[in-house]
């Protein structure tokens, strides 16, 4: 004759996640849950994240009876309240000789003359503030600019008339313009001297420079 199987509430234990079963009646039981779990069989992990302590935009990640903070890259520590020193982590954070300065929640670059941008990678367009004479072409350089003059103009800003236009140098001499004052400079061929290379040279000197 078969015997009815006897129901024992705690055998096997219905409590999960390490909960301890206690029989409370013939057909009833109670689970004593480990910290961090709840429910009649301890099946639910309690969410520890409500009103969490992760700061500076840290994201709460629930654990068992605890939580972790996932921090933005510029913060670290248990609650994302420790500043990351980006200048140590990224030695080349600032380019072109810029100096890295760590700040709370980030960093900044102090750029050398002629460079700008968050990482000092942008060459400042010096032509934006240049005063090359209209008609000339501005060429941007690092922390400076130069003006390319049209024919007939001279000087650093192309604001002077080119004295060489009138061919003041004679006898095949080379004519250059002084960029500061616009005056011509004649480089005389062998045998000639003078401001415009019109004088004969008695002694055997080679080239003579004359400014005018």
């Amino acid at each position: 004759a078969g015997s009815d199987s006897l129901y024992v509430p705690c055998a096997p234990s219905p409590c999960v996640n390490g909960g301890t079963c206690r029989q409370t009646g013939d057909f009833t039981f109670e689970c004593n849950c480990l910290p961090g779990f709840e429910g009649s069989t301890c099946e639910r992990n309690i969410d520890d994240c409500p009103n969490h302590r992760c700061q500076n935009g840290g994201v709460c990640v629930d654990g068992v009876n605890t939580y972790n903070c996932r921090c933005p890259p510029q913060w670290t520590g248990q609650f994302c309240t420790e500043d990351v020193d980006e200048c140590l982590l990224q030695p080349n954070a600032c380019q072109n000789g810029g100096t890295c300065a760590n700040r709370n929640g980030g960093y900044g670059c102090v750029c050398v003359n002629g460079w700008s941008g968050d990482d000092c990678s942008e060459n400042i367009d010096d032509c934006a503030f240049a005063s090359c004479t209209p008609g000339s072409t501005c060429i941007d350089r690092v922390a400076s600019f130069s003006c390319m003059c049209p024919e007939g103009k001279a000087g650093l800003l192309c604001h002077l008339d080119d004295a060489c236009i009138s061919n003041p140098c004679h006898k095949g001499a080379l004519c250059d313009t002084n960029p500061l004052n616009g005056q011509y400079i004649c480089t005389c061929p062998q045998g000639y001297k003078g401001a415009d290379c019109t004088e004969d040279v008695d002694e055997g000197n080679s080239h003579h420079h004359h400014h005018h």
Partner: antibody, heavy 117, light 112 residues
Framework: EVQLVQSGAEVKKPGESLKISCKGS????????IHWVRQMPGKGPEWTGY????????KFNEKFKGQATISVDKSSTTAYLQWSSLKASDTAMYYC??????????WGQGTLVTVSS | DIVMTQSPDSLAVSLGERATINCRSS???????????LHWYQQKPGQPPKLLIY???NRFSGVPDRFSGSGSGTDFTLTISSLQAEDVAVYYC?????????FGGGTKVEIK
């Protein structure tokens, strides 16, 4: 420079209400929780609870739940600790604090609350 | 709550001598993230506590190197290698691994 400046000392009678303040400056106020820490005469500090300025959410030490409330005014970057009915056992120094490298890295100067009939 | 037990309650040390303070927790302070959130504070009369050491052994900015921290799990030590007159204070350990944060009872350091 991070600074937490608290309101002055208070002497109250049992049953009276009280609101003490903590003004934060030198940092982004809404990015950090403000803690309140109690220190009874001759004893060690005890963490009471904190408020999240951004949301106004609070978390308390179970030991202090229901005894006081914590609030915040973001516009004036000020946190408050308030009692509706003081008891003699509330006599203590109350500090506000902010996290940094460790828990409670930056502290206010403290507010002494004396409750006596 | 985690109970933090400090010893001794008070300590008298000669100037220039070593002072050692112990702190024991009722449970391991190793967090699930692998770090141990045990910190040390100094409190002088009429002042708020001041952070000295965070996460067992990291000196907070401006803290003299005569202060050092060590330990693991449940047992931790704060050492003042050469006591100075300005070190007279009460020292507290604090754990923030488990909710809620709990302080030790304090150790009073005096000059012998």
């Amino acid at each position: 420079e991070v600074q937490l400046v608290q309101s002055g000392a208070e002497v109250k009678k049992p049953g009276e209400s009280l609101k003490i303040s903590c003004k934060g400056s030198g940092y982004t106020f809404s990015n950090y929780v403000i803690h309140w820490v109690r220190q009874m005469p001759g004893k060690g500090p005890e963490w009471t609870g904190y408020i999240i300025p951004g949301s106004g959410g609070t978390k308390f030490n179970e030991k202090f739940k229901g005894q006081a409330t914590i609030s915040v005014d973001k516009s004036s970057t000020t946190a408050y600790l308030q009692w509706s009915s003081l008891k003699a056992s509330d006599t203590a120094m109350y500090y506000c604090a902010r996290d940094g490298a460790g828990s409670f890295t930056y502290w206010g100067q403290g507010t002494l609350v004396t409750v006596s009939s | 709550d985690i109970v933090m037990t400090q010893s001794p309650d008070s300590l008298a040390v000669s100037l220039g001598e070593r002072a050692t303070i112990n702190c024991r927790s009722s449970q391991s302070l190793v967090h699930s993230d692998g770090n141990t959130y045990l910190h040390w504070y100094q409190q002088k009369p009429g002042q708020p506590p001041k952070l000295l050491i965070y996460r067992i052994s990291n000196r907070f900015s401006g803290v003299p190197d005569r202060f050092s921290g060590s330990g693991s799990g449940t047992d931790f030590t704060l050492t003042i290698s050469s006591l100075q007159a300005e070190d007279v204070a009460v020292y507290y350990c604090l754990q923030s691994t488990h909710f809620p944060d709990t302080f030790g009872g304090g150790t009073k350091v005096e000059i012998k």
